[in-house]
């Protein structure tokens, strides 16, 4: 039901060529009160002006409600993420109705004639919502749409058409081609609902992107930058490249959103925390681990309701399964000067010793360039709460690894052979952690050695809480 | 109780085209999927595809690409699967199997096998 | 596609034996594994889903286990009507896939 490739064909076909036989009966749309966890169990079909479903199937008027909206489909039957879904609802909200928007027969056609059918869905969805609400006890402020791909934005044309105003809208990756832009009536936006949350997994600035990379929601949470998902390469989906092809690809990045609500529903006590930044290129170099003024906030459904005057994009990284939560670090490094640097960055390695756990060997990403007699900021996740960090082992890695830096390695020697060593000095790295938001200062072991050069390594010890030292003045101001 | 039956046993020449049969009775036809499986002479188990009767939407395996058509009839609870051009590889029993909505659903009741045999 | 491998081919044994058979996935199916028993000029009959859970009905010496790509069946005491052919089938990814049989044959 995802993806305008999903994975049971080849992708040229996809756009073009319709998977569904001609239908005899004109499409409609179902409503499947889901009744228990079991997806064995054939549920409840409602219909609007037939109350006996509703007291037949124990429909809890003042509980809350979720209606489930699927996507484009190529099969004709619902894929696994629905079940997974349903049963995580029913598992965290155990009084909750919880019902399936079967539009199969819309669904199962020409991407773009699926695209046309949103509109006409969204009115079935509302209709529903509209006789709902002449019920006693009912209250639209209880529902919570979950529309995954173009039913992100069937669940935005039900709350654009519904009498009131929905709770909630949580869009889960909401398609791109032919909303890409589009006119806010025409998509997925925040006057839909009370409170529009997005999760953003398949984004792509070339190519197609599957998912829309624009904000429509109160916020947007774009895990791992929106686009490549850890787990997710040819080589992770795959196994054996033999048994494969792109489109899993696809669907796994695509269908990630589903599975990081599901995971918030299920490991509660492992939230995924997101933080407000500008764009992703500055959420990797760690300027955006605050949680100052609602900058940060659970993602999926434990999401706290904020309703920005604009679009909130956030970001986080995470695992690349279940549960999905990693620990975010903000490591400020001041380099006081270097030596000789030539062309090339140094690739730096840290590894993290905490009272709970030592990280693995982090890479420090530097995403444009060391600069000197300046702050240079790094963010590191990792996958273990390391408890409170004792002590920080910092690596500058020896032999270039890339033939892109043996290159300038050298050139440079070409240029400069009696080139002395490389070497730079850092006397103290401030931490910042996401999730705590505690800020810590890390001193070098010996203050008389403060320099490092390649294949060497400096050793930090905590020196203090907080950040401010002692007749200093702070030579960069926090960013958002 | 559920129960699928399917059409009687079948000889065609190469070439030509079968259609068979699955009656459903004992459940709400339109509720769940109706998928076709084959098994070849003393061999295992080949999905072929599936309808959904609730719209008529169809999904085949693509190694039978254009040669197999299934259709329903929701008046009379009916399933059909035609395959066309035959050929001897074809000779197998077709089985019509119930499967909920989800890919995970298991096939849980089956009609008793419709025995085709292509020959010359 | 996913390749579904199931193993023994055949094994032969005794009313009373415990028996397993086990199916390999060429992926991770994410437990959406299901088991059948067929005998001759029959058609089959399912036996377990998700991995796990009994169909009713089905004895409870029947029992299924494994996770990702390794799953077993397992009969704990077999019984003179346990013997006929047994298929495991993923329900992950289309096209659904069985795996080649087990015969399972009295000793």
């Known amino acids: 039901s995802p993806v305008p490739f999903g994975p049971e064909g080849r992708l040229e076909d996809k756009l073009h060529k319709p998977k569904a036989t001609q239908t005899e009966v004109k499409p409609s749309v179902r409503f499947n009160l889901r009744t228990s966890k079991d997806p064995e169990h054939e549920g409840c079909y409602l219909s609007v002006g037939h109350s006996q479903p509703l007291e037949d199937c124990s429909f809890n008027m003042t509980a809350k409600t979720f209606f489930i909206i699927h996507g484009w489909t190529m099969s004709g039957i619902f894929e696994n993420w629905l079940h997974k879904l349903v049963s995580a609802l029913h598992t965290r909200e155990k009084d909750a109705n919880v019902v399936v928007v079967d539009w199969l027969p819309l669904a199962h056609q020409l991407y773009t004639d699926a695209v046309n059918n949103t509109r006409v869905v969204g009115h079935s969805i509302a209709r529903m919502l509209d006789w709902l609400q002449e019920k006693d006890d009912f209250s639209l402020g209880n529902v919570h749409l979950i529309g995954y791909s173009l039913g992100a934005h069937v669940a935005g044309y039900a709350g654009n058409f519904v009498k009131g105003t929905v709770g909630r809208i949580t869009g889960l990756d909401p398609a791109g081609p032919m909303f890409e832009g589009a006119d806010i009536h025409k998509r997925l936006s925040p006057d839909d609902a009370d409170f529009v949350d997005v999760l953003h997994t398949y984004t792509r600035s070339f190519g197609l992107s599957i998912g829309i990379q624009m904000p429509v929601g109160h916020i947007d949470i774009y895990p791992n930058g929106g686009d490549f998902q850890p787990g997710c390469g040819l080589n992770d989906v795959l196994g054996s490249i033999a048994y494969g092809t792109i489109t899993e690809v696809v669907k796994c990045e695509h269908e990630r959103a589903v599975h990081l609500f599901v995971d918030s529903l299920v490991n509660q006590d492992k939230p995924s925390f997101a933080f407000q930044c500008t764009d992703s290129n500055r959420f990797k170099k760690g300027i955006c681990l605050s949680c100052r003024k609602n900058r940060c906030n659970s993602i999926g459904y434990n999401a706290k309701k904020m309703r920005n005057k604009r679009n909130s994009k956030m970001y986080l990284k995470t695992r690349a399964g279940m549960p999905f939560r990693v620990y975010h670090y903000q490591m400020k490094i001041h380099v006081f000067s270097y030596k000789n640097m030539g062309e090339i960055e140094p690739t730096f390695y840290v590894t993290l010793y905490g009272t709970n756990a030592d990280s693995q060997t982090l890479p420090l990403e530097i995403v444009e360039r060391i600069e000197q007699n300046a702050t240079n900021t790094f963010l590191v996740y990792t996958e273990e709460d390391l408890g409170d960090l004792l002590k920080i082992q910092l690596t500058w890695e020896g032999a270039s690894q890339s033939w892109y830096n043996l290159w300038k390695e050298f050139r440079s020697y070409l240029s400069q052979p009696r080139n002395p060593g490389r070497e730079l000095n850092i006397r103290r790295i401030r931490v910042k952690s996401g999730e705590t938001q505690r800020k810590l200062t890390f001193c070098t072991e010996d203050p008389e050695n403060t320099s490092i050069s390649p294949g060497r390594e400096l050793w930090f010890r905590k020196c203090r809480d907080g950040w401010r030292m002692k007749n200093e003045t702070s030579p960069t101001v926090e960013l958002p | 109780q559920v129960q699928l039956v399917q059409s009687g046993a079948e000889v065609k020449k190469p070439g030509a085209s079968v259609k068979v049969s699955c009656k459903a009775s004992g459940y709400t036809f339109t509720d769940n999927t109706i998928h076709w499986v084959r098994q070849a002479p003393g061999q295992g188990l080949e999905w072929m595809g599936h309808?959904?009767?609730?719209?008529?939407?169809?999904n085949n395996n693509e190694k039978f690409k254009d040669r197999v058509t299934m259709t329903r009839d929701t008046s009379i609870s009916t399933a059909y699967m035609e395959l066309s051009r035959l050929r001897s590889d074809d000779t197998a029993v077709y089985y019509c199997?119930?499967?909920?909505?989800?890919?995970?659903?298991?096939?849980?009741?089956w009609g008793q096998g419709t025995t085709v045999t292509v020959s010359s | 596609d996913i390749q579904m491998t199931q193993s023994p081919s055949s094994l032969s044994a005794s009313v009373g034996d415990r028996v397993t058979i086990t199916c390999r996935a060429s992926q991770d199916i994410n437990n959406y594994l299901n088991w059948y028993q067929q005998k001759p000029g029959k058609a089959p009959k399912l036996l377990i889903s998700?991995?796990?859970k009994l169909h009713s009905g089905v004895p409870s010496r029947f029992s299924g286990s494994g996770s990702g790509t390794d799953f077993t069946l397992t009969i704990s005491s077999l019984q003179p009507e346990d013997f006929a052919t047994y298929y495991c089938q993923q329900g992950n990814t289309l096209p659904f896939t069985f795996g080649q049989g087990t015969k399972l044959e009295i000793k």
């Open positions: 199997a119930r499967k909920g909505i989800y890919y995970s659903s298991p096939f849980d009741y």
């Open positions: 309808i959904n009767p609730y719209y008529g939407g169809t």
């Open positions: 998700y991995t796990s």
